[in-house]
């Protein structure tokens, strides 16, 4: 049994992270591997993940680490029954992937603004709340290329957009996702996308 | 230092109630591990009781004879852990000790305690009459 | 689960080699541990997953095995070392962690 590709590891820098990896050959993850990890403090316990497949040859592993703060390390430990097939590291705080945003909600109860208002992932205390920063995608549903992007870069997780910019009569849908700047981290996955009708008309001496 | 302290043992009649603590300090009771608890009665072995998960998700575990009578809760503000007995018997005299344990988890909902590392020194719990 | 340890007693000397078992009635992959209880004192871990030494535990002390058997091995026993041993199987498919009935080494004479 041979590991092809090592694994790497993200975290969402609250309760998880989450390791993949990639085996020689079609594997059954959770009868076959355990994915040991402990954090490099003198009276830490080593703790046990049963992976998941994720494809064939592919698995998936969630370690749990409440409390992640900067400095904390993990030794990681990659075996199939009793052979070691493979030994690292992780530090999280070098390998954040925040948590996606929720609750996404359109309010298009103004009549010439579509407001968008979601929320943070994260609880206060945590200290990716006051670092993130949002990209929403907005898209037509019936012309995919009428799609566009908008970045917010203030704190408050909302964004009012003029509804003359979008089309009349069409529906669209919006997703959103966060990144941390001061963490470096990657963009999170896109929450769940949410869906209206652009009902707006200009007003009859525009048209 | 890291240690675990348990309160709360004495003399109980038969069919009374007694809640015991565990208070750690050294490290956060929130953190990912579980509390558990665990009895030696006079002279015999050691007997798992059963577990709480002390991180965000809660979840506890007990010995099949342990449900219904025992219940274990966490503060974790207070960073303590609580062992309810009820309807308490003589045969449930015995050093209550509270531990620290690692787990095994599949996924992040299913999280199972697999050893005890780290012990407190254990409080006596006497049931007579 | 039950967790079947042997011998209950047993008696050495200084520099002995002393071997534990412990057998689980079904597989518990590595899931076993072992203590070392002193009178009077809460256990202390001495190996988890089968055989893995615990923070601070002197090397004469090993541990192996995995499914349903495993072996508690004292390669040369010291003065200290006098005490009850436990083994501790967890077994997450039918929910319980049981402990062995003990093994009490005593000073032979």
């Known amino acids: 049994m041979k590991v092809l590709q090592e694994p790497t590891c993200v975290s969402d820098y609250m309760s998880i992270s989450t390791c993949e990896w990639k085996m020689g050959g079609p594997t059954n993850c959770s009868a076959e591997l355990r994915l040991l990890y402990q954090l490099v403090f003198q009276s830490s316990e080593t703790h046990t993940c049963v992976p998941e497949n994720n494809g064939g040859v592919g698995c998936v592993c969630h370690l749990l680490m409440d409390d992640v703060v900067s400095m904390d390390n993990y030794t990681l430990d990659l075996w199939a029954g009793q052979q070691l097939l493979w030994k690292g590291s992780f530090k999280p705080s070098e390998h954040v992937k925040p948590r996606a945003p929720g609750n996404l909600t359109v309010h298009t109860n103004v009549s010439d603004t579509v407001l968008l208002t979601w929320s943070n992932p994260y609880p206060p205390d945590n200290y990716l709340y006051n670092d993130l920063t949002y990209a929403v995608n907005i898209w037509n549903e019936n012309d995919l290329a009428d799609s566009r992007i908008h970045n917010v870069t203030y704190l408050k997780p909302t964004l009012r957009i003029p509804a003359s910019t979008l089309k009349s009569g069409i529906s669209y849908r919006a997703r959103v996702r966060a990144w941390a700047q001061h963490y470096n981290t990657t963009w999170s996955e896109w929450s769940p996308s949410t869906k209206w009708y652009n009902s707006y008309r200009e007003p009859f001496e525009q048209r | 230092e890291v240690q675990l302290v348990e309160s709360g043992g004495g003399l109980v009649q038969p069919g009374g109630s007694l809640r015991l603590s565990c208070a750690a300090s050294?490290?956060?009771?929130?953190?990912?591990?579980?509390m558990c608890w665990v009895r030696q009665a006079p002279g015999k072995g050691l007997e798992w009781i059963g577990c709480?998960?002390?991180?965000?998700?809660?979840?506890?575990y007990y010995a099949s004879w342990a449900k219904g009578r025992f219940t274990i809760s966490r503060d974790n503000s207070k960073n303590t852990v609580y062992l309810q007995m009820n309807s308490l018997r003589a045969e449930d005299t015995a050093v209550y000790y509270c531990?620290?344990?690692?787990?095994?988890?599949?996924?992040?909902?299913?999280?199972?305690?697999?050893?005890?590392?780290?012990w407190g020194q254990g409080t006596l719990v006497t049931v007579s009459s | 689960i039950q967790m079947t340890q042997s011998p209950s007693s047993l008696s050495a000397r200084v520099g002995d080699r002393v071997t534990i078992t412990c057998q689980a009635s079904?597989?518990?992959?590595?899931?076993l541990a072992w203590y070392q209880q002193k009178p009077g004192k809460a256990p202390k871990l001495l190996i988890y997953?089968?055989?893995t030494l615990a923070y601070g535990v002197p090397s004469r002390f090993s541990g192996s095995g995995s499914g349903r058997d495993f072996t508690l091995t004292i390669s040369s026993l010291q003065p200290e070392d006098f005490a009850t041993y436990y083994c501790?199987?967890?077994?997450?498919?039918?929910?319980?962690?049981?402990f062995g009935t003990g093994t009490k080494v005593t000073v032979l004479g």
């Open positions: 709480i998960y002390a991180g965000s998700r809660g979840s506890t």
């Open positions: 501790l199987g967890s077994s997450y498919s039918t929910g319980s962690n049981i």
């Open positions: 531990a620290r344990a690692a787990f095994v988890n599949r996924g992040v909902s299913w999280i199972w305690p697999y050893y005890f590392s780290l």
């Open positions: 050294g490290f956060s009771s929130s953190s990912a591990h579980y």
């Open positions: 997953r089968a055989s």
């Open positions: 079904e597989d518990i992959e590595s899931y």
